[in-house]
Interface confidence: low
């Protein structure tokens, strides 16, 4: 008799999810000597344990604690780059500026980047058909709770000047409902963080507007200031030139506005 299966609104678990997580873990520990001690089989077991046999709308941060413990990693707290709706450029930047880190440059972020996963209550099966959508089904789903957990921890670890890359092409440059707006902003520690510096990335070639004056940026400034953290903002008019100048700061053209 075929078993009835809950149909969710979101896409199902990424195909070959267990193999992918394990392979990513092995590759990450090969590339990062400071994480060579990590036992990737234990990491996968802890990851699996967070959502397998559990109702995919009833996941808690507590479920991920064993994984968080195994993935504990020290990154320089003053070299953290947050981002919102502009992941690719943020990642391109940290590949050039090797001493800065996005969440996806850490083991746990790297493992889960771009993947979807969920299980089913009372069975050890992974659901490859569908998983809960954050809006249409429930917010306490395995993927959302994972990113909320690791994002909170990442923001809590930050110190000194924290940078955030924001997408100037979007209607809401700062979105209170994004992971940055709803989790990271509120978990920066005022006793450790002196300044949040926003880099607003322009999309259009001829766009010379000062997007730091955008109402949503002013809203971000207000939230940050109320938390006793200073705020600064820079327009990045030419993201291509920006990356080039990070790579070759001696270049004479890099003294002009980017």
């Amino acid at each position: 008799v075929p078993r009835w299966r809950q149909q969710w609104s979101g896409p199902g678990t990424t195909k070959r999810f267990p193999e992918t997580v394990l392979a990513r873990c092995v590759k990450y520990t090969e590339i990062h000597p400071e994480m060579r001690h990590v036992d990737c089989q234990s990491v996968w077991d802890a990851f699996k344990g967070a959502f397998i046999s559990k109702h995919p709308c009833n996941i808690t941060e507590e479920d991920y604690q064993p994984l968080m413990k195994l993935g504990t990693q020290t990154v320089p707290c003053n070299k953290i780059l947050l981002w919102s709706r502009i992941k690719d450029l943020a990642h391109q930047f940290t590949q050039v500026q090797r001493d800065m880190f996005t969440l996806e440059d850490t083991l746990l972020g790297y493992l889960a980047d771009d993947l979807t996963w969920c299980g089913e209550f009372n069975t050890s099966k992974i659901n490859y058909q569908s998983c809960p959508d954050w809006r249409k089904d429930c917010s306490n789903n395995p993927v959302s709770v994972f990113w909320k957990t690791v994002s909170r921890r990442f923001a809590e670890a930050a110190c000194d000047v924290v940078h955030v890359m924001l997408n100037g092409s979007r209607s809401k440059i700062f979105d209170k409902n994004s992971t940055f707006g709803s989790v990271e902003v509120h978990n920066l520690q005022p006793e450790k963080v002196q300044t949040l510096e926003a880099w607003v990335i322009h999309g259009g070639r001829e766009d010379s507007r000062d997007l730091c004056q955008d109402p949503t940026i002013k809203e971000l400034e207000s939230i940050i200031s109320k938390r006793n953290i200073q705020f600064s903002c820079k327009n990045i008019y030419r993201p291509d030139k920006f990356l080039q100048c990070v790579k070759n700061p001696e270049d004479s053209s890099c003294t002009s506005e980017i």
Partner: nanobody, 124 residues
Framework: QVQLVESGGGLVQPGGSLRLSCAAS????????MHWLRQAPGKEREWVAV????????YYADSVKGRFTISRDNSKNTLYLQMNSLRVEDTAVYYC?????????????????WGQGTLVTVSS
């Protein structure tokens, strides 16, 4: 449309060298990580090497480390694989593939575009 075209394969003796090329078109080549993979007759496709979007990071499978070199020329939209000290077990169809990102995750689950492959035969 988006396309990857490999060339440079052929028959070579053990210990010999070959240089494979992969010409990319239809996307911003300089923005993405690029991979080489291979598939030997009757075997699963195997990841060979990856290079980040700007060429600063390169990683290799243990089986080719020290013998193969991946490189790219973003001005020519071309990816290369220099293969030295070739062995009989290197015989395979070699594919280039585009990563979905700058090269954050170097396993093949992130590949979204493949070439048609070029055959490399190592035999005496």
């Amino acid at each position: 449309q988006v396309q990857l075209v490999e060339s440079g394969g052929g028959l070579v003796q053990p210990g010999g060298s070959l240089r494979l090329s992969c010409a990319a078109s239809g996307f911003t080549f300089s923005g993405y990580g690029m991979h080489w993979l291979r598939q030997a007759p009757g075997k699963e496709r195997e990841w060979v090497a990856v290079i980040s979007y700007d060429g600063s990071n390169k990683y290799y499978a243990d089986s080719v480390k020290g013998r193969f070199t991946i490189s790219r020329d973003n001005s020519k939209n071309t990816l290369y694989l220099q293969m030295n000290s070739l062995r009989v077990e290197d015989t395979a169809v070699y594919y280039c593939a585009k990563d979905r990102g700058t090269m954050r995750v170097v396993v093949y689950d992130t590949l979204d575009i493949w070439g048609q492959g070029t055959l490399v035969t190592v035999s005496s």
